[in-house]
Every structure is written in structure tokens, then in C-alpha cells.
Amino acid sequence: SGTTNTVAAYNLTWKSTNFKTILEWEPKPVNQVYTVQISTKSGDWKSKCFYTTDTECDLTDEIVKDVKQTYLARVFSYPAGNVESTGSAGEPLYENSPEFTPYLETNLGQPTIQSFEQVGTKVNVTVEDERTLVRRNNTFLSLRDVFGKDLIYTLYYWKSSSSGKKTAKTNTNEFLIDVDKGENYCFSVQAVIPSRTVNRKSTDSPVECMGQEKGEFREI
């Protein structure tokens, strides 16, 4: 019947950064296609990526409806050109994904230092508030909107002439730090969600240094 050639998907993996969420799986299809379904624990299954030969499916539109829910996905395998065919048990082969809770598990994207401004011996460093694909009232929410005070930023800063780092923390998107007069400093920020048990830290922002165009210096 052709169904004997159909293999179940395996290695189902969630890839998610700042809520942009893609389900990936194996194997590359040979004479078969896939359809993905997703649901919350208590909800109905919704089909996505119908009869695709891809081995990934973008589920962002579904998970952003409620990022604090826990989601389960499953990948169905069908024989190519005969998608009505079912497996020996009377239904297509499928494999379940691990559970996925976006709020707790989405990776934090690399932050960006928006600007820094020196006024005397103080420097104000501002982190860009990155937009996510989570919506409220037809507006895309920022990372800060979604996580609130659960999200903090760690600033690593150091004199351009040395390598030893100092740190500062904020639960807004701004730091105000003390610096030595006449010294140039470099900055890098990291997003952190301390309440998490996994995926707690982001990769670091690109390093920005005083004396480059992003900053501004004002003598008081």
C-alpha cells in the first residue's frame, strides 16, 4: 500500500529565540511528507505546515497566543502522493515533541547596546528593548513588556586599557555607572532571567567602547 515505506519523524526539537519558535525534526523525507499539529495541554490540535517536505515548521503564530502555556506538537508522516493512506493501525504514523513552555524556555536573543552617554564621571548605558512577535491589542510587545521584572540585564564594563571586568545589574533597560575621569571604557550586556532553571542567559551583546560613534561625551 506504500505505507510500509513511511517512517516516523524523530529527534523533534524546539528552536526558539525571543519567542520566534520553530519545531525541527528528522529524517529528510524520502517518498513521504509531513504535517504538524500543535496544542496546549488542554486544547484542541491545530494543524500547520500541511504535507510539507521540510523538516521544520514555524509555530510562532500559535505559541505567541499565550507564551505561558505549555505546548505539545506532533509530526505526522504520510506517503508522498497518497496522503489519505494510513498506517497499519488505521492512522498515520506520528511522533510527539517534548513539551515546550515559551516563557520558561525560549532562548534570550543577543541584546544590543542602543547608546551610552557620559556625563562627568557617570555613564548611562541603554539597552535596546527588542521587539518580539508576541502581540497584545494588535501591537507587538517588547521583551521587557513580556518578561517585566523577570528580565534583568547584566552589564560588563572595563577600562579599554585593561581586561578585568566590573558588573552592574538592572531590571530596566538602563544602567548608570561610575567611571574614572579621563578613562575610556568598553561595555557588553547580557540578558538574564534568574527565575529560570534553563536558558537563563543570553549571548553577550557586541562590545561597544567609548570613543566610538555610538556614544556621547559631555563634560560638566
Partner: antibody, heavy 121, light 107 residues
């Protein structure tokens, strides 16, 4: 169970070197921050330095800057304190500690048992 | 660097006494203060973080408070196992700094 175990302490001559290890179990060091703290005999606690094992960033107390180097091997879940150009005043029990955040406030919730470093001729 | 001035450096007290230890920061450190207990030959143990939060597993007779740049550790009713040295610590800025310690001895 979360545990930090230091090793590598001992007697060393002034000007000598020593490498201390801080082996972690029960958690992944890259998810946290590791600090080194020392305590001279009969004295209080003195911060030595820190590492963020996730990115390798380090910071040091002025008293050890240029002489001590902190590193981490995430595959071994272990942090290290390389101590060079040792002086008599570096004699102390050395502790590693795990740092976590409560909001923006840091706290050091797990400490190793300490390892004694004696610098003497 | 921020100085943490801890007082008293030592005190004698009896079981059941109420004990208060204070730390004054040389500048604003917000709530970024922790308190640790250390017994001879042992590593420090976290008692209080964020100035007033009791760490998991620590008896409720320990409490912390803040008033501006003054921080207080209170033991409401001293127990035999509480005789130890106590340290405050700020981590508002790098380097993190400790108070000099307060040794609580048996009267």
C-alpha cells in the same frame, strides 16, 4: 544535590604558582557565576575575583590583579584559580562560591569547603 | 570601593537573647546586601539576601532589615548553634565587599 569542591591547595614558596580547582556538581556552572573568596588565618572574608563561565568574562580584586587568573572548563563543570607570583600575604583558605540573582540582587548560595594555601619559604 | 562598616566586632550573649548586628554602607547599595554565618573551620553559609529575604532552610529567628545605608541582622532568640561569626556583604558594585565580621560568643 548542589556541591562545590575545591582542591589544589598546599605549601608553596614566595614567587611560586598554584592552581586551585572548583568542581561543581548538581548544577551547570555556565548558568551561574563563580566567585573566589579567601580568608587569611584569623581574618575576615576577602573577595578575590569572579568568572561568568557562559562567556568567560572575569574580574579581579586589585590585590591580585595581574597575578591571578580565573578560568572555567564548562565541559568539566569546573572553575579554576591560577595563582602566580605568590606572596606571604596570599596565605589563606580559598573558597569558591556560586552566585545567583534575586531580581538584580546577587547572593552566594553555595560555597565549597575551602582549600588552604600557605606561602612560605 | 564601597566600605561595609560592621558593628559590634564581637558580642557576648546568652541563649534566648535577642541579638542585633548592624552594617553601614559607605554609599547607597539599594537592597544589594547579604548576611552570612561562619563557624570555625567551615565555609560561610547564606542567611539573608536582598537585605531582608530569608534564605531557604534558614530558621525564622533570623531576619534582616534596611534603613537607607544601614542594614541590620537580628536573631530573635539566640540558640546554642548560633554562636558563630556573622558577615554582611554588598554586591551593588564591583568589587563586592564584606564587613569585618561580628563574633557572637557565649556569655
Amino acid at each position: 544535590e548542589v556541591q562545590l569542591v575545591e582542591s589544589g591547595g598546599g605549601l608553596v614558596q614566595p614567587g611560586g604558582s598554584l592552581r586551585l580547582s572548583c568542581a561543581a556538581s548538581g548544577f551547570t556552572i555556565a548558568d551561574y557565576w563563580i566567585h573566589w573568596v579567601r580568608q587569611a588565618p584569623g581574618k575576615g572574608l576577602e573577595w578575590v575575583g569572579f568568572i561568568d563561565p557562559y562567556n568567560g568574562y572575569t574580574g579581579y580584586a586589585d590585590s591580585v590583579k595581574g597575578r591571578f587568573t580565573i578560568s572555567a572548563d564548562n565541559s568539566k563543570n569546573t572553575a579554576y584559580l591560577q595563582m602566580n607570583s605568590l606572596r606571604a600575604e596570599d596565605t589563606a583558605v580559598y573558597y569558591c562560591a556560586r552566585a545567583d540573582y534575586h531580581g538584580v540582587d546577587e547572593y552566594w548560595d553555595y560555597w565549597g569547603q575551602g582549600t588552604l594555601v600557605t606561602v612560605s619559604s | 570601593d564601597i566600605q561595609m562598616t560592621q558593628s559590634p566586632s564581637s558580642l557576648s550573649a546568652s541563649v534566648g537573647d535577642r541579638v542585633t548586628i548592624t552594617c553601614r554602607a559607605s554609599q547607597d547599595v539599594n537592597t544589594a546586601v547579604a548576611w552570612y554565618q561562619q563557624k570555625p573551620g567551615k565555609a560561610p553559609k547564606l542567611l539573608i539576601y536582598s537585605a531582608s529575604f530569608l534564605y531557604s532552610g534558614v530558621p525564622s529567628r533570623f531576619s534582616g532589615s534596611r534603613s537607607g545605608t544601614d542594614f541590620t541582622l537580628t536573631i530573635s532568640s539566640l540558640q546554642p548553634e548560633d554562636f558563630a561569626t556573622y558577615y554582611c556583604q554588598q554586591h551593588y558594585t564591583t568589587p563586592p565587599t564584606f564587613g569585618q565580621g561580628t563574633k557572637v560568643e557565649i556569655k
